[in-house]
């Protein structure tokens, strides 16, 4: 409906169909088109003080087409509407109005929000996240061996990002402390993170280990491991289970 206007020809013969051009079925020298060929719309074009009939393949912007058996007419959309299918069904509002269900509104109704890009009232979209993925293996400084207490992480994906007024997304990362059976590292066994890491000189009594990058989700500084008798170890294991800490990243 936003199409170009039909061209009006200069020479028109009074009421003689075969002399009409530009889509006219009948025309006159003074009034231009009087009727149009099928599937064309009749519209009045003002030229100075005079109104001339023209036949258009579609109605100009701000007008809509109505069909009648004898003529198809272009009629103006409502004042607040730029393009429409009819007076009750706007498809694009004038500046400063928001489109909702074919109507142009100053403000969006309750439960909807204004999209200032499309100038529409849209449903408030809340964040949607997937189920948690399984916990990662228990690691410490990228290794799954050579320690007793480490951290494990799990993630979930954002399925639906929220709109401006929507609920924010809950955390998508979660890290907690974990306990593993002490396992000696095999010769040359490396961290699971398959990425080159900066190395630092080991402290006295420390084995040379890869340092996790600053983004590592370790929840707290690791307590240096001390030698404990079997009873103390058991006791600590129970306490650790109860003390499972979660650290979350909010998006």
């Amino acid at each position: 409906q936003n199409a170009s206007r039909g061209r009006r020809q200069r020479r028109m013969h009074p009421n003689v169909s075969q002399g009409c051009q530009g889509g006219c079925a009948t025309c006159s020298d003074y009034n231009g088109c009087l009727s149009c060929k099928p599937r064309l719309f009749f519209a009045l074009e003002r030229i100075g003080m005079k109104q001339i009939g023209v036949c258009l393949s579609s109605c100009p912007s701000g007008y809509y087409g109505t069909r009648y058996p004898d003529i198809n007419k272009c009629t103006k959309c409502k004042a607040d509407c730029d393009t429409c299918f009819n007076k009750n069904f706007c498809t694009k509002c004038k500046s400063g109005f928001y489109l909702h269900l074919g109507k142009c509104l100053d403000n969006c109704p309750e439960g909807l929000e204004a999209n200032n890009h499309t100038m529409e009232c849209v449903s408030i979209v809340h964040c949607e996240v997937s189920e948690w993925n399984p916990w990662s293996p228990c690691t410490k400084k990228g290794k799954t061996c050579g320690f007793k207490r480490g951290t494990e992480t799990r993630v979930r994906e954002i399925i639906q990002h929220p709109s401006a007024k929507g609920n924010l997304c809950p955390p998508t990362n979660e890290t907690r402390k974990c306990t593993v059976q002490r396992k000696k590292c095999q010769k040359g066994e490396r961290g699971k993170k398959g990425r080159e890491r900066k190395r630092k000189k080991p402290n006295k009594g420390e084995s040379k280990e890869a340092i996790p990058d600053s983004k590592s989700l370790e929840s707290s500084k690791e307590i240096p491991e001390q030698r404990e008798n079997k009873q103390q170890q058991k006791k600590r294991k129970v306490q650790d289970k109860q003390k499972s800490v979660s650290v979350s990243t909010v998006h």
Epitope: Q1, N2, A3, R39, F41, S57, S58, Y64, G65, T66, R67, Y68, N72, T75, T83, F85, N86, K87, N88, F89, T91, K92, L101, G102, K103
Partner: antibody
Framework: QVQLVQSGAEVKKPGASVKVSCKAS????????IHWVRQAPGQGLEWIGY????????GYNQKFKNRVTMTVDTSYSTAYMELSRLRSEDTAVYYC??????????WGQGTTLTVSS | DIVLTQSPASLAVSLGQRATISCKAS??????????MNWYQQKPGQPPKLLIY???NLESGIPARFSGSGSGTDFTLNIHPVEEEDAATYYC?????????FGAGTKLELK
């Protein structure tokens, strides 16, 4: 004469997306809006939305708003309707139609979409 | 949304007789003196075909045995005399408001 020719049948899994095309001929493509309507097996007709080929402006039935995208390629006089996050209830015949002065006067032959796991 | 209720859901008519299908809208589909109601015919495996536009106007190429009437919320499609090729499902459709809606359809069978 006016003709709307649609792409062939599609079989998709739940969660996937589908893009149906509608090639127009026999008239000036930018003159009329193109609408999409669907019909589930043995059911009635349901309006999905429209697009103006002249400027790409589109509007959708609220029911489909977050899942449907309509586009046009005026150089090929073709309209497209993409439906995402498919579910079994989307199994239907999808029609494109020209909208002339508030009625659907020409229709495509329909594209059958089957959504099944 | 404007709900269109068609009745009957199906009807069987003898050749040469009259078939009358009703369509009631949940709110008026009239505006500025125009009725935004259309009627379509659909045969199995085919797309719908426009019969009547603006409540009472016959689409070009459609036989004169089809006629439409009504305004506001009550509309009727008449087929008289019914011919064999008229066996199909008929739908009313309103264009007055967003979203555009269709009736559930009326299946016409021949006795």
């Amino acid at each position: 004469q006016v003709q709307l020719v649609q792409s062939g049948a599609e079989v998709k899994k739940p969660g996937a997306s589908v893009k149906v095309s509608c090639k127009a001929s026999g008239y000036t493509f930018t003159d009329y809006s193109i609408h999409w309507v669907r019909q589930a097996p043995g059911q009635g007709l349901e309006w999905i939305g429209y697009i103006y080929p002249s400027n790409g402006d589109s509007g959708y039935n609220q029911k489909f708003k977050n899942r449907v995208t309509m586009t046009v390629d005026t150089s090929y006089s073709t309209a497209y309707m993409e439906l995402s996050r498919l579910r079994s209830e989307d199994t239907a015949v999808y029609y494109c139609a020209t909208y002339f002065a508030n009625n659907f006067d020409y229709w495509g032959q329909g594209t059958t979409l089957t959504v099944s796991s | 949304d404007i709900v269109l209720t068609q009745s009957p859901a199906s009807l069987a008519v003898s050749l040469g007789q009259r078939a009358t299908i009703s369509c009631k809208a949940s709110q008026s589909v009239d505006y500025d003196g125009d009725s935004y109601m259309n009627w379509y015919q659909q045969k199995p495996g085919q797309p719908p075909k426009l019969l009547i536009y603006a409540a009472s106007n016959l689409e070009s190429g459609i036989p004169a045995r089809f006629s439409g009437s009504g305004s506001g919320t009550d509309f009727t499609l008449n087929i008289h005399p019914v011919e064999e090729e008229d066996a199909a499902t008929y739908y009313c459709q309103q264009s007055n408001e967003d979203p555009l809606t269709f009736g559930a359809g009326t299946k016409l069978e021949l006795k």
